[in-house]
């Protein structure tokens, strides 16, 4: 619970509220410091600040409440309740509530701990949500090489909008036992599946860091079988030295595949978002957006109105495609019973044609036993390229013992011919390597995030029984915290081996590189924060978890270690790859300029119940510097783009923006004038946590 | 329609106080940040102070700070202006505005 | 503060003909979001400013078609491609991409 500021003073807890669509939404008994459901027994989530505002003056109307403000971090809420129904619901959704401010507005006083420096910002020329305000502070302690600590907003200009952040740094030392309690907060993630997700929603709905859950749904006990046996990993964290990749493809140890409710209703949700039909709306604007087209299997361009509409409505392809590609796909292979590893892999253009040797492998799709299959076909690669060298040498011999009485120019075209057959072998062959190994990794990757998938849902639903069992809990969390260091170490390898084949695509790919690594950051972190919200469960198993983030840090640094100072990798048989010499130079594996440093590859933190693991971008596209990217929508109803007050919208026949040569006539048009009343919107993103289980 | 009606404005002495009053209707008052606008006798028009829609920001410029104050009651869709210390620079005709939409104005002058 | 310059300070015009009035801004009105926070304002003599184009090309409620906004960044025009006798008064330009709101020092157009 945050503490109460000077505008409740006497009470017992802070005015909040919490929302999770297809819920009644909750508001915190301020005298008893419980979660209350909504008195009316009508109110689910709202989607804009003002009604937030509103809502939070209609819960608590004994006090004065005049903002809003998101919380800085998610809290478990337990007992949420349909519309209708007598009986609630006990099972919980982690949200992050709103804080509803109390009288004139007071900064949030925060502690500063021994060696940390309390800092500010103010800008009276922004005007900017508290997601603006947190990358700022988190961005202002990276640059002094501190971590966040916690964060509060200064100088309100608007619902849930300020002029400046208030925040505590401290060294990256300190914050192993307190790694930016704020951070946990779901930052860019609208919660999308909420209602429709309208221009001028301003992303407002609560932030679920849980994914949506279908209560009618029946509940699936995960019939687990002896903790000792969760424990018997086979997976532990040393590197086998003949294959990078081998260790991210042994075969897994067969988990019970029992689907959580959480999975299935995202993917749900996902498939149902995605294949929603692309809808305008009914306001005029002509805002460029994106859309799923099932059909296609692709994103589309659309027009949407600005207001209305559904969620299938995304501000850019990437997103679209992040959000539905994945699934959409996932769920016609699941339809058609075929394992998620078995995504068609791009195959690279070098390859001029697919050789035998190598044909069964890239036509089998991947399975369990990748790593056999992918060593079989190396090794009929090589045999291949050796039987076929030695034909030519026999042949270049047989031609050079012909060759003895003709002319020198004939001799000499005879070796050029044969120089040129071997060249043309190798050149052949290294393709043929190259898109072994591509598809070899494609698949892993698959692998990867599908045990990843896993792992996040066996843990989720680990801290979700009722009531949870710390030491399955732990399981689960060590396996899906394997199932990350291995993506990340995959990522880290791939990119190496581009590096070394192709140093401009490298370049071109970093920013990508650095994003993954990046997501997998803030989706680890974003997990582990989930721990910190049954302090019971935290409390018992602390020190297994510390000891545990230790191990995998410290393997993380000797990963990056080997990374910064072999210029090369090892496919397990350097026969496989073609002669790099030229190429070993000044390795960079990713730029330590100030555009990304090996501190943002680090995820492992230990840190104090009492502390919850940072998350701060969420990005799941490539990165962009724009702390609130989009703000182009309002908070105010059907304002911005639109230009239209709801409350007028029958009396507009068109946009003014839209309407310039029509013979519509406009009254009483009402424009969002000031810049500072622009709100952020990030349109239909989905957070990683969601990521985690759908996208990834 | 969109109305906003000024009141308050007078004649007043260089040091004495005033207090402005803007009457909205025809839009929700309560979603728009307001502002007060002056225009010098020159005709040259300055921001004087501005507040966000909840009132929990106010902005002024360095001329007013200190001696101008902006609020709001949105439950009576009014914005005030109180101004003290005033100067005879502050004599102005004084326009409550949403931004796109401006009162007739309110005429204050300060002179002995 | 973001400074607004506006030329000429005063345009005569016959009826009919073509007006162009011009405006710059210290620095850019582009708001993250893209839009364009720039505007126009038409002052008829003894009335308050009323909004003529907003967000650099966007006629407001009412804005005959004869009148045009256009430009970039920190460069704006307003052109009228026939000057009504109702046109006439003083145009001013302004920002409200950065607090503090400001505008330029007008623009009067007159007959010749």
């Known amino acids: 619970l945050e503490v109460p500021t000077d505008g409740n003073a006497g009470l017992l807890a802070e005015p909040q509220i919490a929302m999770f669509c297809g819920r009644l939404n909750m508001h915190m008994n301020v005298q008893n410091g419980k979660w209350d459901s909504d008195p009316s027994g009508t109110k689910t989530c709202i989607d804009t600040k003002e009604g937030i505002l509103q809502y939070c003056q209609e819960v608590y109307p004994e006090l004065q409440i005049t903002n809003v403000v998101e919380a800085n971090q998610p809290v478990t809420i337990q007992n949420w309740c349909k519309r209708g129904r007598k009986q609630c619901k006990t099972h919980p959704h982690f949200v992050i509530p709103y804080r509803c401010l109390v009288g004139e507005f007071v900064s949030d006083a925060l502690l500063v701990p021994d060696k940390c420096k309390f800092l500010h910002q103010e800008r009276m020329d922004v005007c900017e949500t508290h997601l603006h305000w947190h990358t700022v502070a988190k961005e202002t302690c990276s640059e002094k090489s501190t971590n966040l600590h916690d964060y509060g907003m200064l100088l309100p200009c608007g619902i849930d909008k300020f002029r400046g952040v208030e925040f505590v740094c401290c060294p990256l030392a300190e914050e192993s036992d307190n790694v930016d309690s704020a951070d946990a907060e779901e930052d860019d993630s609208d919660v999308w599946w909420g209602g429709a997700d309208t221009d001028y929603a301003d992303g407002s709905e609560d932030k679920v860091v849980e994914v949506a859950e279908e209560e009618e749904v029946a509940e699936v006990e995960e019939e687990e079988a002896d903790d000792d046996e969760d424990d018997e990993d086979g997976d532990e964290v040393e590197e086998e030295a003949e294959e990078p990749y081998e260790e991210a493809t042994e075969r897994t140890t067969s988990i019970a595949t029992t689907t959580t409710t959480t999975t299935e209703s995202v993917e749900e949700v996902v498939r149902e978002v995605c294949s929603e039909q692309a809808e305008t709306g009914p306001c005029r604007a002509m805002i460029s957006r994106w859309y799923f087209d099932v059909t296609e299997g692709k994103c589309a361009p659309f027009f949407y109105g600005g207001c209305g509409g559904n969620r299938n409505n995304f501000d850019t392809e990437e997103y679209c495609m992040a959000v539905c590609g994945s699934a959409m796909s996932q769920s016609l292979l699941k339809t058609t019973q075929e394992p998620l590893a078995r995504d068609p892999v791009k195959l690279p253009t070098t390859a001029a044609s697919t050789p035998d040797a190598v044909d069964k492998y890239l036509e089998t799709p991947g399975d369990e036993n990748e790593h056999a299959h992918f060593q079989k076909a190396k090794e009929r690669l090589e045999a291949k390229h050796r039987e076929r060298m030695s034909q030519v040498m026999r042949e270049w011999e047989e031609a050079e013992r012909q060759a003895k009485n003709l002319p020198k120019a004939d001799k000499k075209a005879v070796i050029q011919h044969f120089q040129e057959k071997v060249e043309s072998l190798e050149q052949e062959a290294a393709n043929e390597r190259q898109q072994l190994v591509e598809t070899h990794m494609a698949r892993v990757e698959a692998m990867l995030n599908d045990r990843r998938r896993l792992a996040l849902e066996n843990y989720i639903t680990a801290l979700q029984a009722v009531p949870p069992r710390p030491r399955h809990v732990f399981n689960m969390l060590k396996k899906y915290v394997r199932a990350e260091q291995k993506d990340r170490q995959h990522t880290l390898k791939h990119f190496e081996h581009v590096r070394m084949v192709d140093p401009k695509k490298a370049a071109q790919i970093r920013s990508q590189v650095m994003t993954h690594l990046r997501v997998i950051y803030e989706r680890m972190n974003q997990s582990l924060s989930l721990l910190y919200n049954v302090p019971a469960v935290a409390e018992e198993i602390q020190d297994e978890v510390d000891e545990l983030l230790q191990k995998e840090q410290n393997y993380s640094d000797d990963v990056l270690a080997n990374m910064i100072s072999e210029p090369r990798i090892s496919y397990g048989n350097d026969a496989l790859m073609p002669s790099l010499t030229e190429t070993k130079t000044t390795v960079e594996l990713l730029p330590v300029n100030g555009e990304f440093s090996l501190d943002d590859l680090q995820p492992w933190h230990s840190f104090g119940a009492d502390s919850v693991p940072a998350n701060t971008e969420n990005e799941v596209e490539p990165v962009d510097a724009r702390p609130a990217a989009d703000r182009g929508l309002t908070t105010r109803p059907g304002s911005g783009l639109t230009n239209i007050k709801t409350e007028e919208i029958s009396e507009v026949k068109m946009d003014a923006e839209f309407r310039h040569d029509s013979g519509y006539e406009v009254h009483h048009q009402k424009l969002v004038f000031f810049a500072e009343d622009v709100g952020s919107n990030k349109g239909a993103i989905i957070g990683l946590m969601v990521g985690g289980v759908v996208i990834a | 329609e969109v109305k906003l009606v000024e009141s308050g404005g007078g004649l007043v002495q260089p040091g004495g106080s005033l207090k402005l009053s803007c009457a909205a209707s025809g839009f929700t008052f309560s979603d728009y940040t307001m502002s007060w606008v002056r225009q010098t006798p020159e005709k040259r028009l300055e921001l004087v102070a501005e507040i966000s829609n909840t009132g929990g920001s106010t902005y002024y410029p360095d001329t007013v700070k200190g001696r101008f104050t902006i609020s709001r009651d949105n439950a009576k869709n009014t914005l005030y202006l109180q101004m003290s210390s005033l100067k005879s620079e502050d004599t102005a005709m004084y326009y409550c505005?949403?931004?796109?939409?401006w009162g007739q104005g309110t005429t204050l002058t300060v002179s002995s | 503060d973001v400074v607004m310059t506006q030329t000429p300070l005063s345009l005569p015009v016959s009826l009919g003909d073509q007006a162009s009035i011009s405006c710059r801004s210290s620095?850019?009105?582009?708001?993250?979001?893209?839009?364009?926070?720039f505007h126009w304002f038409l002052q008829k003599p003894g009335q308050s400013p009323k909004l003529l184009i907003y967000?650099?090309?966007n006629r407001f409620s009412g804005v005959p078609d004869r009148f045009s906004g256009s430009g970039s960044g920190t460069d704006f025009t307003l052109k009228i491609s026939r000057v009504e006798a109702e046109d006439l008064g003083v145009y001013f330009c302004s920002q409200s991409a950065h607090v503090p709101w400001t505008f330029g020092g007008g623009t009067k157009l007159e007959i010749k």
């Open positions: 620095q850019s009105l582009v708001h993250s979001n893209g839009n364009t926070f």
């Open positions: 967000k650099v090309s």
């Open positions: 505005a949403s931004g796109d939409y």
